[in-house]
């Protein structure tokens, strides 16, 4: 009789342990769901506000034709500037035409005045060729005016209405670029 009671007690204890484990799993699952829900809500909120505004560019970005531009309010070296743009789903500015250059320099004059802004242009150390970040060559009219006398890597920046070059490790503002969202209307 005592053995039977002991066996039942052990079975009950085992069942209790299993229930505790299940409860722990459920709590963990619930927490995970809550976290996912938070992400989803934030994502939906962004999507809805974007859809509601139907704005082709995010807040604080400037639109010109098919592009959105972000003019930074902080200084950083060229490589960090590129990473900062990537976090926002963009790349450093790639100037395709004189019209785009004019728009950028005109906008900068209105916003901040005559400062230095990194763009996505760098000089290959071996060949000395200037290339945009996607590997394409700048059009002849969009080459940096002065050759930097630097033994280090050289990168391009915009100042006033000129493209210039400087040691990539100097600190400057920067400009990011992404595609404008097409209106679905």
């Amino acid at each position: 009789k005592l053995l039977q009671v002991s066996t039942i007690a052990m079975q009950q204890q085992e069942k209790l342990i299993q229930q505790e484990r299940a409860l722990l799993n459920f709590t963990e699952w619930k927490r995970s769901c809550a976290l996912q829900m938070k992400y989803c809500q934030a994502f939906m909120q962004n999507s809805l506000s974007s859809a509601h505004n139907s704005s082709p560019c995010p807040n604080n970005w400037i639109q010109n034709r098919e592009s959105c531009y972000y003019v930074s309010e902080i200084w950083s070296i060229w490589h960090t500037s590129q990473e900062n743009c990537l976090k926002e789903g963009s790349t450093l500015l790639q100037i395709e035409s004189k019209e785009e250059m004019d728009f950028i320099t005109g906008s900068l004059r209105k916003i901040k005045g005559s400062y230095d802004y990194w763009v996505g242009l760098s000089q290959d150390g071996h060949s000395g060729r200037w290339l945009w970040q996607d590997g394409s060559s700048p059009s002849p009219g969009l080459l940096p005016a002065e050759r930097s006398q630097s033994a280090n890597q050289v990168c391009g920046y915009v100042k006033s209405n000129s493209l210039l070059s400087s040691n990539c490790s100097t600190w400057k503002y920067f400009i990011c670029e992404k595609y404008a969202l097409r209106s679905s209307v």
Epitope: Q36, Y39, F43, E83, L86, K87, E88, G89, S90, T91, Q133, D134, G135, E177, K178, Y179
Partner: nanobody
């Protein structure tokens, strides 16, 4: 959280090609761009190539014209096609997810190019 898993590394001869893959899982909608970094022994980790969700690309000067980054959105995977490999490309290659709230890294895959 976001998990990134690299594959495709290995030992090859100079001039050969390799294709690295980075599979992303988890809360990937927080990721705005994906990139490949590399770290050679005794050197700093450097950005090799990156691609945004819109398909805009960026490359390090040393790999322009040799490496190509691409993505397959259906598979949540980013690829790095490495052609004309040089001994200087020997390094551990890491996949990185760029997000406004933080960055996510993979464990890395070793690429060794022998001369």
């Amino acid at each position: 959280q976001v998990q990134l898993q690299e594959s495709g590394g290995g030992l090859v001869q100079a001039g050969a090609s390799l294709r690295l893959s980075c599979a992303a899982s988890g809360s990937i909608f927080s990721i705005n761009a994906m990139g490949w970094y590399r770290q050679a022994p005794g050197k700093q980790r450097e950005l090799v190539a990156a691609i945004t969700n819109q398909g805009r690309t960026t490359y390090a000067d040393s790999v322009k014209g040799r490496f190509t980054i691409s993505r397959d959105n259906a598979k949540n995977t980013v690829y790095l096609q490495m052609d004309s490999l040089e001994p200087e490309d020997t390094a551990i290659y890491y996949c990185k997810g760029f997000s406004p709230t933080g960055d996510y890294w993979g464990q890395g895959t070793q690429v060794t190019v022998s001369s």
